[in-house]
Amino acid sequence: FERTRSLQDPCSNCPAGTFCDNNRNQICSPCPPNSFSSAGGQRTCDICRQCKGVFRTRKECSSTSNAECDCTPGFHCLGAGCSMCEQDCKQGQELTKKGCKDCCFGTFNDQKRGICRPWTNCSLDGKSVLVNGTKERDVVCGPSPADLSPGASSVTPPAPAREPGHSPQ
């Protein structure tokens, strides 16, 4: 089948990095500067992505692969292939329509992105608060008051933070 296909379609012999040039009797021509073809048999080369403005070049375009972008310092990538850049905030903040705002009391964010999440409710698991929460850190739950017998000193990490609006499973 491959042999038949190549006899019928000379373009199928054109490798990645080239295109089948109809203007030159279907000769395989190299992709022009700032363009690429990542698969064989293509009749055109694709224009390379340009990482401009808030986007930085992570990987240069080549004749066989597109450029890859990331974001300038102070921003992070969003979307497939870093299609957008979103500004960072400080830990203890979240990004809102009004810019970076401190987490409300009872919530925290330990990253430069994402939303403030509620502190873990230790009492739901029958535990007590060992270390208070802050804007940047979740509470640390300790043993329940009943467990605080002589010699007992187990400390468990907090349960995974739940997203606001999601009830416990």
């Epitope: 403005g53 969003l78 979307g79 957008m84 979103e86 329509k97």
Partner: nanobody, 123 residues
Framework: EVQLVESGGGLVQPGGSLRLSCAAS????????MTWFRQAPGKGLEWVAH????????YYVDSVKGRFTISRDNAKNSLYLQMNSLRAEDTAVYYC????????????????WGQGTTVTVSS
């Protein structure tokens, strides 16, 4: 080609005013939130203001509230930043940027960026 081109920057004395413009082309301007950022010499990029698709919502960084006004003219595919009572600390390159799809609902990511226009506030 999707493009944003800023203009209107220049040298102005403290207390003076400037109006920046951003001409958009190659996309449906009225379908996107639009944003102004700035970068002072030796500093990182700072968000300044943004405006909803129809102009009904506008938000500003605290340092420019009451002095700067963001606006848009969807018929002219243009974004503006009126800058009054300018201070030395407003000296920066100002960039307009397009909010990506879903902006303000699920994220505040921008996907298209202008080349910038320089504002210098000095006596």
């Amino acid at each position: 080609e999707v493009q944003l081109v800023e203009s209107g920057g220049g040298l102005v004395q403290p207390g003076g005013s400037l109006r920046l413009s951003c001409a958009a082309s190659g996309f449906t301007f009225s379908s996107h939130w639009m944003t102004w950022f700035r970068q002072a010499p030796g500093k990182g990029l700072e968000w300044v203001a943004h405006i909803k698709e129809d102009g009904s919502e506008k938000y500003y960084v605290d340092s420019v509230k009451g002095r700067f006004t963001i606006s848009r003219d969807n018929a002219k595919n243009s974004l503006y930043l009126q800058m009054n009572s300018l201070r030395a600390e407003d000296t920066a390159v100002y960039y307009c940027a397009r909010g990506g799809e879903g902006y303000s609902d699920s994220h505040f990511g921008v996907d298209v960026w202008g080349q910038g226009t320089t504002v210098t506030v000095s006596s």
